[in-house]
């Protein structure tokens, strides 16, 4: 027989199957060109001295063989005597150590046995009832396939799975979805219902993120408020990178985790927009307001758990930057303007109360007045800061109030509301003898002293009822006692105390009469 032909004679070895565990297996035959065919198989066991024979039986019952020698792959043409247009039965017999080992048989029509393409192009990945669904367009003119997948994680080897039979222009597969680790998938196809047909190559890797994106482990720090009333939010720790399987390392579309920064400005609730979402890489500048910051991780399956931080308000105060004038029509605030066409947000809340009780007012965009000041006025009827108590005021400014990250702090300060001059009058003024010509005057702290920076000083006035002479003594706002000396015994005096702010003179307390008794010597 010619080597290129299938030999229709008895093979050159005895016909007996040893039934041993080793031997040929996994025979695959397919058409490789218009007129050529290839069969290949695996051989289990020691290969030394093994001769392989590809056996073929036609539908007529006639059988032939090709001698492959030690090779486990053999090509032949459509002129080799094998009927390619009709069904044939093929198997391999391996002659080794004086015994014959036989592979399982495959029955197929060689003419139509083409090697399929793997899924090509775009493989769409989605989540379906806790599983992974992959979908792709069937390669043209290859409808009718068996599909397998294999998958691995960064720490596990390949595992094989079955997608089942496919018979449409689109094919799909349900695969396991891991909760917390990324996976690499590959798919392959072969002709449906064709015994012994060859699997395609594996597809390109499909990289799939875990169902839950990793929780971002990041830390923030906030810089000091700068001269421009803004402070930078900086990232102290980058989010941990997802560990990827081997085929997904480098460029792995599909496994990307995106981290977004969600800012919620808690202060100034009357502004138009309170939240803004940014990319984590773009760290924003913030005003001195209080913020909640959340880092949201998400992948192609949606958002995961987020991590939230509270950034407290910057409480650094500027006691002199704000002027307040109280008139009969109402109250006006003045402060150094930031720039042209600025919107200001004035926020106030009673000191010592929950931050949720802040009230605010938004101005229309305004230009500086001739003195370079910005203003905000309100009437007594509005009730704004009308109670006689200490308020914490913060003024924010923005040229683009709709953009959350463009607000800056103009100033933060304290203000005593209502009729501060009367409310601040010191009470419980008492006079005690101190020496032969001096007394000690004490009083209870003014209500204004509860308001940091508001009380400028106390003034103690002493009036000599005989001569009508008056002396005034300034006292530090932190003190509530003064010693009046150079007094004369037997003279009647009255003493009063008032509390002044930077812009208001206080109301005198009720006059307190006293005198130093004349000492009689023995």
């Amino acid at each position: 027989c010619r080597t290129s032909e299938c030999c229709f004679q008895d093979p050159p070895y005895p016909d007996a199957d040893s039934g041993s565990a080793s031997g040929p297996r996994d025979l695959r035959c397919y058409r490789i060109s218009s007129d050529r065919y290839e069969c290949s198989w695996q051989y289990e066991g020691p290969t030394a001295g093994v001769s392989h024979f590809l056996r073929c039986c036609l539908s007529s019952g006639r059988c032939c063989y090709f001698a492959a020698g030690s090779a486990t792959r053999l090509q032949f043409s459509d002129q080799a005597g094998v009927s390619v247009l009709y069904t044939v039965t093929l198997w391999v017999e391996s002659w080794a150590r004086n015994q014959t080992e036989k592979s399982p048989e495959v029955t197929l029509q060689l003419y139509n046995s083409v090697k399929y393409e793997p899924p090509l192009g775009d493989i769409k990945v989605s989540k379906l009832a806790g599983q992974l669904r992959m979908e792709w367009e069937t390669p043209d003119n290859q409808v009718g396939a068996e599909v397998q997948f294999r998958h691995r994680t960064p720490s596990s080897p390949w595992k094989l799975g079955d997608c089942g039979p496919q018979d449409d222009d689109t094919e799909s597969c349900l695969c396991p979805l891991e909760m917390n680790v990324a996976q690499e998938f590959q798919l392959r196809r072969r002709q449906l219902g064709s015994q012994g047909s060859s699997w395609s190559k594996w597809s390109s890797p499909v990289c799939v993120p875990p169902e839950n994106p990793p929780q971002p482990q990041v830390r923030f720090s906030v810089e000091q408020l700068g001269q421009d009333g803004r402070r930078r939010l900086t990232l102290k720790e980058q989010p941990t990178q997802l560990e990827l399987p081997e085929g997904c390392q480098g460029l792995a579309p599909g496994t990307e985790v995106t981290y977004r920064l969600q800012l919620h400005m808690l202060s100034c609730p009357c502004k138009a927009k309170a939240t803004r979402t940014l990319h984590l890489g773009k760290m924003p500048y913030l005003s001195g307001a209080a913020y909640n910051v959340a880092v949201i991780s998400s992948n192609q399956f949606g958002p995961g758990l987020n991590q939230t931080w509270h950034i407290p308000a910057d409480t650094h105060t500027e006691p002199v930057a704000l002027n307040i004038s109280v008139g009969t029509n109402g109250t006006t605030m003045y402060w150094p303007a930031r720039a042209q066409s600025m919107t200001y947000c004035i926020e106030w809340q009673p000191v010592g109360q929950d931050g949720g009780l802040a009230t605010c007012s938004l101005t229309a965009p305004q230009d500086p007045d001739p003195a370079g000041m910005a203003t905000y006025s309100w009437s007594r009827e509005s009730g704004a800061m009308g109670q006689e108590k200490c308020y914490y005021i913060t003024i924010f400014a923005s040229a683009h109030p709709e953009k959350l990250t463009l607000w800056s702090t103009v100033l933060s300060t304290y203000h005593f509301g209502g009729n501060a001059s009367a409310a601040g009058t010191p009470h419980h003024v008492s006079v005690k003898n101190h020496s032969l010509d001096s007394v000690s005057v004490d009083w209870a702290p003014s209500l204004l002293s509860t308001c940091p920076g508001v009380l400028k000083e106390y003034v103690v006035r002493c009036r000599d009822e005989d001569s009508k002479q008056v002396s005034e003594h300034p006292v530090q706002p932190t003190e509530t006692q003064v010693t009046l000396s150079g007094l004369r015994a037997g003279v009647a005096y009255t003493v009063q105390v008032r509390a002044d702010t930077a812009w208001l003179r206080g109301v005198w307390s009720q006059p307190q009469r006293f005198s130093i008794e004349v000492q009689v010597s023995d």
């Epitope: 058409r31 060109s33 218009s34 247009l85 009709y86 029509q109 003419y111 139509n112 083409v114 399929y116 393409e117 367009e137 069937t138 390669p139 043209d140 003119n141 290859q142 409808v143 009718g144 222009d169 002709q191 449906l192 219902g193 064709s194």
Partner: nanobody
Framework: EVQLVESGGGLAQTGGSLTLSCAAS????????MGWFRQIPGKDREPVGE??????????ADSVKGRFTISRANAKNTITMSLQMHSLKSEDTAVYYC??????????????????WGQGTQVTVSS
């Protein structure tokens, strides 16, 4: 459904050439192979050749081998199969039909294994 339309038939001289085309539209991705058959009055349809679309593998009947060539071109939702006929003989005179099959077990010599057919185009070879 798949629709097949042939074109290019006509009169040719002995020894001359002619090219037939077959345009397939509709659910073309599901077609496995397209072939040509011919028929002369009073006789059965006989195979000319076939092409397996995904690979471009061809089959030719012995009577046309070396003279006829089948090729295919794919566009979105349309496949065009061509039959180039050279060294034409008078016995090539027939109505030529384009056919398509969707099954992987079909035999290119058996007309009944093709699900879709064109309306046919006449080829006449005169001396």
């Amino acid at each position: 459904e798949v629709q097949l339309v042939e074109s290019g038939g006509g009169l040719a001289q002995t020894g001359g050439s002619l090219t037939l085309s077959c345009a397939a539209s509709g659910r073309t991705p599901s077609i496995v192979a397209m072939g040509w058959f011919r028929q002369i009055p009073g006789k059965d349809r006989e195979p000319v050749g076939e092409i397996i679309l995904s690979k471009g593998f061809t089959y030719y009947a012995d009577s046309v081998k070396g003279r006829f060539t089948i090729s295919r071109a794919n566009a979105k939702n349309t496949i065009t199969m061509s039959l180039q006929m050279h060294s034409l003989k008078s016995e090539d005179t027939a109505v030529y039909y384009c056919a398509a099959r969707q099954n992987w077990s079909g035999n290119p010599t058996r007309p009944n294994e093709y699900e879709y057919w064109g309306q046919g185009t006449q080829v006449t070879v005169s001396s």
